[in-house]
Amino acid sequence: IWELKKDVYVVELDWYPDAPGEMVVLTCDTPEEDGITWTLDQSSEVLGSGKTLTIQVKEFGDAGQYTCHKGGEVLSHSLLLLHKKEDGIWSTDILKDQKEPKNKTFLRCEAKNYSGRFTCWWLTTISTDLTFSVKSSRGSSDPQGVTCGAATLSAERVRGDNKEYEYSVECQEDSACPAAEESLPIEVMVDAVHKLKYENYTSSFFIRDIIKPDPPKNLQLKPLKNSRQVEVSWEYPDTWSTPHSYFSLTFCVQVQGKSKREKKDRVFTDKTSATVICRKNASISVRAQDRYYSSSWSEWASVPCS
Amino acid sequence: RAVPGGSSPAWTQCQQLSQKLCTLAWSAHPLVGHMDLREEGDEETTNDVPHIQCGDGCDPQGLRDNSQFCLQRIHQGLIFYEKLLGSDIFTGEPSLLPDSPVGQLHASLLGLSQLLQPEGHHWETQQIPSLSPSQPWQRLLLRFKILRSLQAFVAVAARVFAHGAATLSP
């Protein structure tokens, strides 16, 4: 058993049929010695008396808020949560496996630049009695600070018969060094509590590996005289690291016909313009990627040829 | 060419070669990008590699003030990786494919390090840890880790030279 926060404790349980329960001794936080009684949750029934209460925690029915009282006055509370371990593996019932980029990916994170700011998100089908708490650091043995905000519900989607909820959190490295080569990964730890179930999820990454630039901005077409060719121009996204002479991007320009089956013409360039042939009803799209490190491409920025 | 004492390197040549290094490092093992090698337990090799750190002056401001600190750090790293790529980690079993870009990568590392430091001028270099993994699978894992680390190193070096070429060239 360990303390998650003040008056909230996590009991770690082996979750198999013939596992013994965990013996837990609750102590009433009071200088009083006599006349103390214990209750659980909303029930007024007395579960025991005395300054300590020894319980066996085996089921979710044994978890909850234990309260000690004296003469009708509440003295203290202890909320017990359960953390299940099945076949030596901690349960992951609360969050959905996103399976990208690999199985058992519960947290996904992205950064728009090298400033040390990043966003993580996760999915669940649970709509109520759910809380998240996020902590982060750079490195784990001698951790350096990363400050995370509160996790918020960022999207709701209907997937078949189920509703899916996306939560996200923004974090900022306290002393980020955008130009340095990272040697210690960022660690992100999410505590999830659903009713009386506690779970924790972790992700470890380098900012460089989760970079995904915003799409190029101000995408414009300039027809070239007496030609089907057009000059496409664009600019670096506002959110990208500066100076651009140092934090450079490379771009992919694509001409796509109306039908998905039509052949796509693609051009790769380090410049912020390119000359392409504009077909009727086609569209021109441009996306960006770090020039020197193959992290994710941005989403496409598009304009119609006409 | 860089010259002793603190003259500028051939920024544009260094830029071109470092960008080529980036391409080669990723083509040497593109799949490396999708493998989470940190799960495999960090071995001394990848812990001991020279990283370009915050105080090394490789940021735009540091380069403007005095690029020599950063260039020395980059040179150290290039020599370190060049030696690793020439060691039995890469020459031993399992053999690299004949068309593997590792050979080119090795040569380019040497080329860039020579651009930074001509004969007769010596910067302090870092000691290479003696590594001789016994099992072929250990060697394979080590290769992945070294290449993954190299990808990050050459990306920073390429940024330095691109910025230098754009802003510090005479």
């Epitope: 949750d41 909303q42 029930s43 319980i55 925690v57 089921e59 029915g61 234990y66 | -």
Partner: antibody, heavy 119, light 107 residues
Framework: EVQLVQSGAEVKKPGESLKISCQSS????????IGWVRQMPGQGLEWIGI????????RYNPMFRGQVTMSVDKSSSTAYLQWSSLKASDTAMYYC????????????WGQGTMVTVSS | EIVLTQSPATLSASPGERATISCRAS??????LAWYQQKPGQAPRSLIY???NLQSGIPARFSGSGSGTDFTLTISSLEPEDFAVYYC?????????FGQGTRLEIK
């Protein structure tokens, strides 16, 4: 006052189905799991299983798994034990009981339902 | 599953006497053992839980002791209403199991 009131005695033929009930009152129904115990004529007590009234989480005695089904209706604070096809060997007194949280034993018992299966 | 063996199967005693019933587990159940009393035609009633804790409303002449595999229920001075069948139950490991029962009869 805590009370567990069980449905009346049943006489059934082999192969028939049956559902007996146990209505709780006088306490917070969702705080306490409900269990069932069998006592065959002239024999001792046998633990059938327990069930959470919150989310219908169930722990069956392997000996009874597939033989009986436990269920619960939160809205009426009632627990059920049912058989889809009775056998003569199901003849027994069935008790529902309230599981004490933080312990696991039964602190309050229903009066019992006698089930007789005979052709 | 854990087997609980009660002894004796039958105990004859007189009112006012001290009665002791033993319960032995086939493996350790820590202190997670309860004692119940059952009278003819009635449901069982909880007497002792966690090996030695008296259930609310139960007279103080009933007491329990033991831990691990050996447990004892003691009635310090028998009253006429104490003659019944007594069962021990372990609730440490599923499936929870009962002892076979001890009949306490008037001598």
């Amino acid at each position: 006052e805590v009370q567990l009131v069980q449905s009346g005695a049943e006489v059934k033929k082999p192969g028939e189905s049956l559902k007996i009930s146990c209505q709780s009152s006088g306490y917070s129904f969702t705080t306490y799991w409900i269990g069932w115990v069998r006592q065959m004529p002239g024999q001792g007590l046998e633990w059938i299983g327990i069930m959470s009234p919150v989310d219908s989480d169930i722990r069956y005695n392997p000996m009874f798994r597939g033989q009986v089904t436990m269920s619960v209706d939160k809205s009426s604070s009632t627990a059920y034990l049912q058989w889809s096809s009775l056998k003569a060997s199901d003849t027994a007194m069935y008790y529902c009981a309230r599981r004490r949280p933080g312990q696991g034993y039964f602190d309050f018992w229903g009066q019992g339902t006698m089930v007789t299966v005979s052709s | 599953e854990i087997v609980l063996t009660q002894s004796p199967a039958t105990l004859s005693a007189s009112p006012g006497e001290r009665a002791t019933i033993s319960c032995r587990a086939s493996q350790s159940v820590s202190s997670w053992l309860a004692w119940y009393q059952q009278k003819p035609g009635q449901a069982p009633r909880s007497l002792i839980y966690a090996a030695s804790n008296l259930q609310s409303g139960i007279p103080a002449r009933f007491s329990g002791s033991g831990s691990g595999t050996d447990f004892t229920l003691t009635i310090s001075s028998l009253e006429p209403e104490d003659f019944a069948v007594y069962y021990c139950q372990q609730y440490n490991i599923y499936p929870f199991t009962f002892g076979q029962g001890t009949r306490l009869e008037i001598k």
